[in-house]
Structures are given as structure tokens and as C-alpha cells.
């Protein structure tokens, strides 16, 4: 492999924790217009496994607002609007990266963290366990 | 928002772009009890709007591999296994943060980027447009 020369154009880091503590530019690329998932689609209402979106706010985290899906029913909604309990509404989860202020309240010091969020719900056939 | 007091124990930043460039501890903290709980469900197969997972790979990004859900059908799967085209399988999308080296090959400088990924699929009632 190529030995990468220390580039004079790179930010310098003499931090004793290097390489674990680095500079991160938060001037985000691909900043989308909407951050509220309700604005981007109404699937949460039209799904056979509808969900509500709950605002999870934490000023010590970036992004400070994350929307968490909670399935409205245990079962799935049929064409007639009734709930079919032979099927299950389940949350689809995704692991995401966030930044958490560390130490707390320090405006420019963060730690990378992985958290699990529920993005929406889907309707699944239940697993039936047969008792011998 | 709250005015965060300048804590004397915080790393100092006189960067003119502050708070766009921050110090981040990259020793990733996983808030979940198991290594990766999202990996253990088979909803993608059991859903009435099943999906396949496609690999999106980029060696210059962390995480290097992201899985993209692609709905298997236009319609939704009925109890008898046939597809009902009066309903629609649609992808549920989520905006996630990834890290990219910037400038490239600088060991201690990163940029945060937002990307939109499809996490799974859900079954929705179609929007019917009536022609006057």
C-alpha cells in the first residue's frame, strides 16, 4: 500500500487521544429540505400497519430531533377498516449514527454513537409456535 | 434552545466556522444491549410487502456497507400467497448520517453527510385519482 504522506492541507492533531478524537465538519452535504418524515410521505396513515410518529428530542445529541415510529395496532388494518389480529404490525428498525455531546454541555465536543430507531411499521404473518 | 455555558473542561475551539467543525470521539458507543439488534428480524420475508436487501458499498464512507431495501412486488402479498395489485408495496425511507473523509486521506478530518436509505417496505392503500 502507499504510505500516505502527512498532508500539509490536513488539519493537524497533536491530541493524545488521536486517532480517536478527530475534527468533523458538520456543514452537512445533501441537506434535504424536510427533516420531518410526516412531510415526505403519508405512508404512516395509509399503511395496513399504520404508525404514529413520536418526536424524540435531546439537546445533547446531533441530530437533536429524531422521529420514532410506534405501530398503532397489534394487528393489521383490513380493507374494511377493521383490524385483523391474525396478522401483526411490527416496527422496522434501523441502526443510525448520531453525535452525543461529551462532556455534556460542551458545544464543540461530541462522541459518535450508534442508536436503534423505529422508522415505520410493516404487516407480517405471525410465527406460530406449535406446542408438542 | 438553551444557552450552553462554556465549560472550562471542554476542548477549546476558536474556529471561525464554529460550531460547524467540532471534535468527535470516534470510539463508537453502542447504546443497544446486543451488538446489532436490527440484524435479527426476518420481517423482510414475512411481510405482506416483502423486500430484498441490496448492498450499497462505498469504501470512502463509514459505514462502508449500507443495505438498501427494494420491494419485491408492486402489490402486496395476500394470505394465499398471491399478489394483490389493488394495494401497493412501498419503501419506507430514512435519512441517516454517515462519515466521509475530507480531505481524502487526512487521517483526522471527516465530514458528516446525510443520505436517504430505504429501510424496508410497507403495504399501503393506493391514492386513486379520479378523472373529472
Amino acid at each position: 500500500g502507499i504510505a500516505i504522506p502527512r498532508n500539509s492541507g490536513c488539519p493537524n492533531s497533536e491530541d493524545k487521544n488521536f486517532p480517536r478524537t478527530v475534527m468533523v465538519n458538520l456543514n452537512i452535504h445533501n441537506r434535504n429540505t424536510s427533516t420531518n418524515p410526516k412531510r415526505s410521505s403519508d405512508y404512516y396513515n395509509r399503511s395496513t400497519s399504520p404508525w404514529n410518529l413520536h418526536r424524540n428530542e435531546d439537546p445533547e445529541r446531533y441530530p437533536s430531533v429524531i422521529w420514532e415510529a410506534k405501530c398503532r395496532h397489534l394487528g393489521c388494518v383490513k380493507a374494511d377498516g377493521n383490524v385483523d389480529y391474525h396478522m401483526n404490525s411490527v416496527p422496522i428498525q434501523q441502526e443510525i449514527l448520531v453525535l452525543r455531546r461529551e462532556p455534556r454541555h460542551c458545544p464543540n465536543s461530541f462522541r459518535l454513537e450508534k442508536i436503534l430507531v423505529s422508522v415505520g411499521c410493516t404487516c407480517v404473518t405471525p410465527i406460530v409456535h406449535h406446542v408438542a | 434552545g438553551i444557552a450552553i455555558p462554556r465549560n472550562s473542561g471542554c476542548p477549546n475551539s476558536e474556529d471561525k466556522n464554529f460550531p460547524r467543525t467540532v471534535m468527535v470521539n470516534l470510539n463508537i458507543h453502542n447504546r443497544n444491549t446486543s451488538t446489532n439488534p436490527k440484524r435479527s428480524s426476518d420481517y423482510y420475508n414475512r411481510s405482506t410487502s416483502p423486500w430484498n436487501l441490496h448492498r450499497n458499498e462505498d469504501p470512502e464512507r463509514y459505514p462502508s456497507v449500507i443495505w438498501e431495501a427494494k420491494c419485491r412486488h408492486l402489490g402486496c402479498v395476500k394470505a394465499d400467497g398471491n399478489v394483490d395489485y389493488h394495494m401497493n408495496s412501498v419503501p419506507i425511507q430514512q435519512e441517516i448520517l454517515v462519515l466521509r473523509r475530507e480531505p481524502r486521506h487526512c487521517p483526522n478530518s471527516f465530514r458528516l453527510e446525510k443520505i436517504l436509505v430505504s429501510v424496508g417496505c410497507t403495504c399501503v392503500t393506493p391514492i386513486v385519482h379520479h378523472v373529472a
Partner: antibody, heavy 117, light 106 residues
Framework: QVQLVQSGAEVKKPGSSVKVSCKAS????????ISWVRQAPGQGLEWMGS????????NYAQKFQGRVTITADESTSTAYMELSSLRSEDTAVYYC??????????WGQGTLVTVSS | DIQMTQSPSSLSASVGDRVTITCRAS??????LNWYQQKPGKAPKLLIY???SLQSGVPSRFSGSGSGTDFTLTISSLQPEDFAVYYC????????FGQGTKVEIK
Amino acid sequence: QVQLVQSGAEVKKPGSSVKVSCKASGGTFSSYAISWVRQAPGQGLEWMGSIIPWFGTTNYAQKFQGRVTITADESTSTAYMELSSLRSEDTAVYYCARDSEYYFDHWGQGTLVTVSS
Amino acid sequence: DIQMTQSPSSLSASVGDRVTITCRASQGISNWLNWYQQKPGKAPKLLIYAASSLQSGVPSRFSGSGSGTDFTLTISSLQPEDFAVYYCQQYSDDPTFGQGTKVEIK
């Protein structure tokens, strides 16, 4: 094309340590993890731990916790695995592998470590 | 740890045969299962990732299926170069491998 080239075979005494290197040629480490997997003679594969060289973050298998140290030097695109307090059961071929955190898609050629008095 | 159990531990087959190897996980792992081929004195080689996706450069006679706890690797028409040991591996949690299946010439 990524190639992982490992250091040569080692013979060690019980109680000593061994440090095996793994150099990525044909590119940098990129954002992948590097995992270490060992295989005792005639046996199966056993994951020992991993490092994300970009971050220096390590993750070790419970069995090797406290005895294994994985490090990486990005300037030379080299990862290292050091195993201490060696015993005869540690005689094995040690492999490094590029790890996407979902699968191991590129492997080193392996380094035979023999522990014998 | 998640235990992976392969069967059979060895099998004898002829060139042209259809070969099936199974792998069972001690708990549900969704589709986070990979298959590797290892020849004597060589490093393992990734064949199938995420239960059913063929790694680039791997012949299409190899295929994988399954989800949850039960998985299968199939070689549709065994070729001389396919005689080797095959391992399954889960990555739902810290990685663990099956004990291996040796495919020998009949």
C-alpha cells in the same frame, strides 16, 4: 484490487507474546474494519476481534478479551494482532480479513504461529 | 454466542452432482449468513453473503437460501475445483462459524 499481506511464520515459547502484521496493498484500509480469525490445525475458524483503522475502535471476542490487542497504523496501512500469555492451544494459522461488519471479503494468506517449549 | 451447526460434516460426491449443505443457527439471525470455501493451505474465500447474494467473481452454480435459523448452500453441478471445505458464518452478532463441511471426491 485489495490485497492483505501478512508477516511470516513464528515459533514462540509458552507464556510469551506474538505480534502478527497485516499490510493492505493496492489501496488504503478505507473505512472497513480489519478482523483477525484463527484456525488451529485441522480445526474450524474462530473470530478473535476487529479494529476500524479510521477510528481506532476495537471489538474483541469474549474468549480473547484481555489477551489480544489489535492495533492499526494508517500511515503504513498495516494492522497488528498481538496475543499474549501464549499456550500450546494457541498454535494455529492466524488470518487477517477485511471486514465490512457483515462479511469478510478479502483475506490475508495466513501466518502460522507455533507455540512450543 | 450464536452457535452454528453444519450438516453433514463431510460428503462424497462426483463431478456433475448437485450438492446441498445445511447450516442451522442457535437463534434467529435474519439473513446475516455467509458461506466460505477453503482449500488446503489457503485462506477462506467468500462465496455467498447475506444468505443468498453471490459475491462477485463466484460462479453461478453456487447459490444460497434460507432465513431465520435454517440456511442452505447448493452447488448445482459440482466441478473438480469445488472439492474443498465449506463454512457458514453468522454476522448477526459477533461472528461465529460453523464447524465446516468437507466435500470429497467419490
